[in-house]
């Protein structure tokens, strides 16, 4: 027989040879990390027809790490359904815990021994520390030293000193999340006021207020023989000026060629003019949107 | 508190042009919408324009074609400039704040009556 | 350009009474109406803005109300320094304009 089958698991018992007699037999025994369990056998002897008789490695299992319990508030995930060195040992924590130490363990091999690469991690609630404080406002449970997960809080502007109230800029509600970190940036409070917007030759439509305080939204319309250079919705934003920004009424014009007449309202101008109803979904300068401010 | 006072010649020749200024003090003009106001004798009151702080202005239609309003920032200074004028020009006229960007006239100048004659 | 017409153009009452003015504009103008005080030879004060918003400084007797194009102006007990000329005034639309006027005198 030539040389002997080799094997994954098993390892021949001493040196191989190029050619064995018929009859000769060879053992093997269990490679470094694998243990034998009867009652396989693991020789084989060579066969009058110059072959060897069947064998397999499947008496030599892998060496297995310890069995290592779910965490606290946590889960340990097999990655590939056995303890046997090489295998992946996945962590996570249930919703309101974070991990403490490594997410994945790998079964590996210390001389014959299989041992875990690191110590089991932990799952600790996720906690966070107060919110930030702001100017001119406050929030919900400002006496809190600590909070848990999901725990909100709800952010309010003072009373302003003048005429103008603040305005709450961001999320007014905001929650402990995950990474022990708040769910957004805390809001600003201050005086947020939109100058009134003036629009010659057209006019406001809706959106009336006394005064235009922020996300106050306000929409126009040009006279007749106008047409809108611009949206005719703005809101105010949170810098005090109005996005997008104040639109202008220019005058329609017939043919390129024909000059439109001064204004006093800067900013650039097409040359030329197309007719009003060149410009779906705004109102023809005989269909006012309210007709009865015509 | 802020104050504003106009002045300017009180008598001007008709087809000329009329020049006044409004002074601003105990603030600066940067921070000012002004408004030139009119009012003829015995009559009501007459908007001629405005000017706001980013130096855009609004005149009504009615005396569009002969009417500038500028701001010298330098002297502290707003001026109304009507050209071409005839008698029906003449009237006291005003410089008054717009209220914080809102039209309404919460501060005024105290007028200068301004008369159009040969 | 919107119209604003007053009335009456001129009235005459006592200190004490209850007195209302008028203002009509020739089309919707919402909210956006001042009022203004003018005594002889002084330029005009305001009085109230945004139909009914009192200014800084103007007493609670004072009181406007209103909505799209017709207004008041009423105060409610009359003083002695209350005797003027009163004006409208509408800003939803350029050219801003002003009412005729109300003159308000001593009976």
């Known amino acids: 027989c030539e040389a002997p089958p080799t094997f994954e698991a098993m390892e021949l018992i001493g040196k191989p040879k190029p050619y064995y007699r018929v009859g000769e037999r060879v053992d093997y025994k269990c490679k470094k990390g694998y243990f034998y369990i009867p009652p396989l056998a693991t020789h084989t002897i060579c066969d009058r027809n110059h072959t060897w008789l069947p064998v397999s490695d499947e008496g030599c299992y892998r060496e297995m790490c310890p069995h290592i319990r779910d965490p606290l508030n946590g889960e340990a995930i097999l990655a590939n359904g056995s303890y046997e060195f090489g295998a992946e040992l996945h962590f996570i924590c249930n919703e309101g815990y974070y991990l403490i130490g490594k997410d994945i363990l790998y079964c590996e091999l210390k001389d014959t021994v299989a041992i875990w690469s690191g110590k089991p991690p932990l799952c600790e609630k996720i906690l966070c520390t107060p919110p930030p404080k702001i100017k001119n406002g406050k929030h919900t449970f400002s006496e809190v030293e600590v909070f848990e997960y999901l725990d909100a809080v709800t952010y309010s502007c003072d009373p302003a000193p003048g005429p103008d109230p603040f305005s709450l800029i961001g999320e007014s509600m905001i929650y402990c999340g995950n990474n022990s970190t708040w769910s957004h940036a805390a809001p600003e409070c201050k005086v947020v006021k939109c100058r009134f917007p003036v629009v010659e030759n057209g006019k406001q439509i809706s959106g009336f207020g006394k005064k235009f305080y922020y996300k106050a939204t306000v929409m126009f319309e040009c006279d007749k023989g106008y047409y809108l250079n611009g949206s005719d919705k703005i809101v105010c934003e949170s810098n005090s000026t109005w996005d997008p920004p104040v639109p202008k009424c220019l005058k329609v014009s017939t043919s390129p060629t024909t000059k439109s007449p001064t204004s006093s309202a800067s900013g650039p101008r097409p040359t030329y003019k197309p007719p009003v109803s060149n410009y779906p979904g705004y109102p023809k300068p005989d269909e006012g949107i309210l007709n009865n401010l015509d | 508190q802020v104050q504003l006072q106009e002045s300017g010649p009180g008598l001007v020749k008709p087809s000329e042009t009329l020049s006044l200024t409004c002074t601003v003090s105990g603030g600066s003009v940067s921070s000012y919408d002004i408004s030139w106001i009119r009012q003829p004798p015995g009559k009501g009151l007459e908007w001629i324009g405005v000017?706001?702080?980013?130096?855009?202005?609004n005149y009504n239609s009615a005396f569009m074609s002969r009417v500038t309003i500028s701001v010298d920032t330098s002297k502290n200074q707003f001026s109304l400039k009507l050209s071409s004028v005839t008698a029906a020009d003449t009237a006291v006229y005003y410089c008054?704040?717009?209220?914080?960007?809102?039209?309404?006239?919460?501060?005024w100048g105290q007028g200068t009556l301004v008369t159009v004659s040969s | 350009d919107i119209q604003m017409t007053q009335s009456p153009s001129s009235l005459s009452a006592s200190v004490g009474d209850r007195v209302t003015i008028t203002c009509r504009a020739s089309?919707?103008?919402?909210?956006?109406l001042n009022w203004y005080q003018q005594k002889p030879g002084k330029a005009p004060k305001l009085l109230i803005y945004y139909t009914s918003s009192l200014h800084s400084g103007v007493p609670s007797r004072f009181s406007g109300s209103g909505s799209g194009t017709d207004f008041t102006l009423t105060i409610s007990s009359l003083q002695p320094e209350d005797f003027a000329t009163y004006y409208c005034q509408q800003y939803i639309k350029l050219p801003w304009t002003f009412g005729g006027g109300t003159k308000l005198e001593i009976k």
């Open positions: 089309q919707g103008i919402s909210n956006y």
């Open positions: 000017i706001w702080t980013d130096g855009g202005t």
């Open positions: 008054a704040r717009v209220y914080d960007g809102y039209p309404w006239f919460a501060y």
